[in-house]
C-alpha cells in the first residue's frame, strides 16, 4: 500500500538586509505566469549563493512568499512582483509559507511500541 | 540554461564607436533581462547597461549615460551595446549576462544566471 504525502505548513517572519551582493534570490509565479495551478501567487525558485537570503539561511526555494514590507502579493503580475522587491530598499521584511513534505506510513494498524513513522 | 555569445569588439580610437552583440539561445529571449558588464586588466567587475525582459526599461552605469545605448531585438534574440565616444577607459572585456525573475536590481551581478565568455574592446 502506498503512503500518503501530507504537507505541513508554516509561516514565518523574514527580515533580510540586502547587502553589497543583494537579497540574491530569484521569484516565479504571478497572475500571467501561475507557477502553481490555480495559485496566482509568488514562489522562490532559486536561492543564489552568497545573497543575504543564503547567508540567513530561512528562505527555501519552493517558498511562498505572501507579503514584502507588509504589502500583500496577491494577485500581482510576475514583473509587478519583481518591481516590488527591486523597490523595497536595503531592510526587506518578508511573510513566507513553508511547505514542509510529511510522508505517512502506509494506511493500516501500526503496532504499539512500532518506531517507524 | 542560456547559452549567450558576444561579438563586435575591437580595437577603435578615442572618440570612435563599436557596437557589441549578444545573441541568446536556451530559453524564452524575450522574458529575460539582459545586461552587460565589464572588467577591465586590474579592476573589479563594473555594471554597464541593463535592459529587463518584460517591459523593455534600461538602466546605465554613470559612467557611460549618454554615450551608449543597450536596446534588444526579440525577433533575433539579441541585446545589443551601441558605444559612441569611446574614451581610454571604456577599454575593457565587456561581459553579456541573462537572468530571470532575480528581486535584484539589474546593476547587480547576482540578478543574473548565465554569462558570455567576453569579448575584447580597445581604446587607442
Known amino acids: 500500500m502506498n503512503g500518503r504525502v501530507d504537507y505541513l505548513v508554516t509561516e514565518e517572519e523574514i527580515n533580510l538586509t540586502r547587502g553589497p551582493s543583494g537579497l540574491g534570490f530569484n521569484i516565479v509565479g504571478g497572475t500571467d505566469q501561475q507557477y502553481v495551478s490555480n495559485d496566482s501567487g509568488i514562489y522562490v525558485s532559486r536561492i543564489k549563493e552568497n545573497g543575504a537570503a543564503a547567508l540567513d539561511g530561512r528562505l527555501q526555494e519552493g517558498d511562498k512568499i505572501l507579503s514584502v514590507n507588509g504589502q500583500d502579493l496577491k494577485n500581482l503580475l510576475h514583473q509587478d512582483a519583481v518591481d516590488l522587491f527591486r523597490n523595497a530598499g536595503y531592510a526587506v521584511s518578508l511573510r513566507v509559507q513553508h511547505r514542509l513534505q510529511v510522508q505517512n506510513g502506509p494506511i493500516g494498524h501500526r503496532g504499539e511500541g512500532d518506531p517507524s513513522g | 540554461q542560456v547559452q549567450l555569445v558576444e561579438s563586435g569588439g575591437g580595437l577603435v580610437q578615442a572618440g570612435g564607436s563599436l557596437r557589441l552583440s549578444c545573441a541568446a539561445s536556451?530559453?524564452?529571449?524575450?522574458?529575460?533581462?539582459m545586461g552587460w558588464f565589464r572588467r577591465a586588466p586590474g579592476k573589479e567587475r563594473e555594471f554597464v547597461a541593463a535592459?529587463?525582459?518584460?517591459?523593455?526599461?534600461?538602466d546605465y552605469s554613470d559612467s557611460v549615460k549618454g554615450r551608449f545605448t543597450i536596446s534588444r531585438d526579440n525577433a533575433k534574440n539579441t541585446v545589443y551595446l551601441q558605444m559612441n565616444r569611446l574614451k581610454p577607459e571604456d577599454a575593457a572585456v565587456y561581459y553579456c549576462?541573462?537572468?530571470?525573475?532575480?528581486?535584484?536590481?539589474?546593476?547587480?551581478?547576482?540578478?543574473?544566471?548565465?554569462w558570455g565568455q567576453g569579448t575584447q574592446v580597445t581604446v587607442s
Open positions: 549576462a541573462a537572468g530571470f525573475g532575480s528581486v535584484d536590481g539589474l546593476e547587480y551581478p547576482i540578478s543574473y544566471d548565465d
Open positions: 535592459i529587463s525582459g518584460s517591459r523593455g526599461s534600461t
Open positions: 536556451g530559453r524564452s529571449f524575450s522574458s529575460l533581462d
